[in-house]
Interface confidence: low
């Protein structure tokens, strides 16, 4: 049978050679992360303004407040991504106006709108994970035929103490998957 | 910057319940997780379990069906609440902020309460 | 549950040399997003712990450029470049990758 390279899992998008997982539940900031975790993935940390345009355009489209991986919980102020790199000035242009403000201690960005926000990061929100996607010269198992593949299941023993937690969530994320053949 | 207080009674009656609480000052408590710990005299750390708001936990099995955690927003306190307590749960308890997965660590630790059980 | 076995669990040392502690793990704290999920706690006589090293290899704030931590997968050290006075108490390694959390027994640094 004919071999197609599908270099992101079933469900996950692909753009400019990452993979993207927009979120069909809710969780706060930090479940948020360990859901991406979960799944050898990273709460979403945007590299260029190409792909933070193609993110906007997605959260936007969906209507929905989208948490990304950046806050500023480690010093107030300071904004921080998840990988440890410090928001450049040149995305500073994407705050929506007047934001960030941190009124009522908002330490984690969420896309909003048109912009990003801050809000407060005990809420449940979408988010997006982002992972890099499957080189097309080796034989993965992102090579499908003639059905796609379930996601990529989590790494054994990961999750940063919320195993318990996300098996729901897992759970959910392959249900989903079989619904949709 | 953030502090930690713990607070409740020095003494439990075998069988009765452990109730402690944390104060969180100098910052909001929604934006982290929340840990206990606790250590016998001369021993080492034991981890109880953290939580996150009241509906986002993560306990010790080995106290799993005895522990409760709670956050009360409103008072930026969480509490501790252990159950069926007997002289093996007589330790220094510790309160701490759990920086996440992302941060990582626990910092800054309350300086302790201890807790003694017996009759 | 991951079972962490600290070594040595007594370690004698002379002021402004150094000290070396040994952590592992029984199964992997490096996590496919390159972290390990492994941390380090001083705790002086009478006092709270206090976190000196976070996932693997960070210094947390305020903690001396003499401490340092390394490794990857199981095995990880805390170094000591020269070890002061005020670096007496025991030392703890954890392992955050998942629940239960788990502690090391601790090694007991005190000065000859």
């Known amino acids: 049978t004919e071999r197609l390279c599908h270099p992101c899992p079933w469900e996950w998008t692909f753009f400019q050679g990452n993979c993207y997982f927009m979120s069909n539940s809710q969780r706060n900031w930090h479940d948020s992360i360990t859901a991406c975790k979960e799944v050898g993935a990273q709460l979403v940390v945007i590299k260029s303004a190409e792909e933070q345009n193609f993110l906007q355009l997605q959260s936007s489209r969906s209507n929905r407040f989208t948490w990304m991986g950046l806050s500023d919980l480690n010093q107030e102020g300071t904004w921080q991504w998840v990988d440890g790199s410090p928001l450049l000035p040149s995305f500073k242009q994407y705050w929506n106006r007047g934001e960030p403000n941190n009124v009522g201690e908002e330490d984690c960005a969420e896309f909003s709108g048109n912009g990003w926000n801050d809000d407060k990061c005990n809420l449940a929100k979408f988010w997006i994970c982002k992972k890099s996607a499957a080189s097309c010269s080796r034989d993965e198992e992102q090579f499908l035929s003639p059905a796609p593949a379930t996601p990529n299941p989590p790494p054994a023993g990961s999750g940063g103490g919320l195993n318990d937690i996300f098996e729901a969530q897992k759970i959910e994320w392959h249900e989903h998957h079989h619904h949709h053949h | 910057q953030v502090q930690l207080q713990e607070s409740g009674p020095g003494l439990v009656k075998p069988s009765e319940t452990l109730s402690l609480t944390c104060t969180v000052s100098?910052?909001?408590?929604?934006?982290?997780?929340w840990t206990w710990i606790r250590q016998p005299a001369g021993k080492g750390l034991e981890w109880i379990g953290r939580?996150?708001?009241?509906?986002?936990?993560n306990y010790n099995p080995s106290l799993k069906n005895r522990v409760t955690m709670s956050v009360d927003t409103s008072k930026n306190q969480f509490s501790l609440r252990l159950n069926s307590v007997t002289a093996a749960d007589t330790a220094m308890y510790y309160c701490?902020?759990?920086?996440?997965?992302?941060?990582?660590?626990?910092?800054?630790w309350g300086q302790g309460t201890l807790v003694t059980v017996s009759s | 549950d991951i079972v962490m076995t600290q070594s040595p669990l007594s370690l004698p040392v002379t002021p402004g040399e150094p000290a070396s502690i040994s952590c592992r793990s029984s199964?992997?704290?490096?996590?496919?997003?390159?972290?390990?999920?492994l941390d380090w706690y001083l705790q002086k006589p009478g006092q709270s712990p206090q976190l000196l090293i976070y996932?693997?290899?960070n210094r947390a704030s305020g903690v001396p450029d003499r401490f340092s931590g390394s490794g990857s997968g199981t095995d990880f050290t805390l170094k000591i470049s020269r070890v002061e006075a005020e670096d007496v108490g025991v030392y703890y390694c954890?392992?955050?990758?998942?629940?239960?959390?788990?502690f090391g027994q601790g090694t007991k640094l005190e000065i000859k």
């Open positions: 701490a902020r759990d920086r996440g997965t992302y941060l990582g660590g626990f910092d800054p």
């Open positions: 100098g910052g909001s408590i929604s934006s982290y997780y």
């Open positions: 939580v996150f708001t009241s509906e986002s936990t």
């Open positions: 199964q992997s704290l490096l996590h496919s997003n390159g972290y390990n999920y």
């Open positions: 996932l693997g290899s």
């Open positions: 954890i392992q955050a990758l998942q629940t239960p959390f788990t």
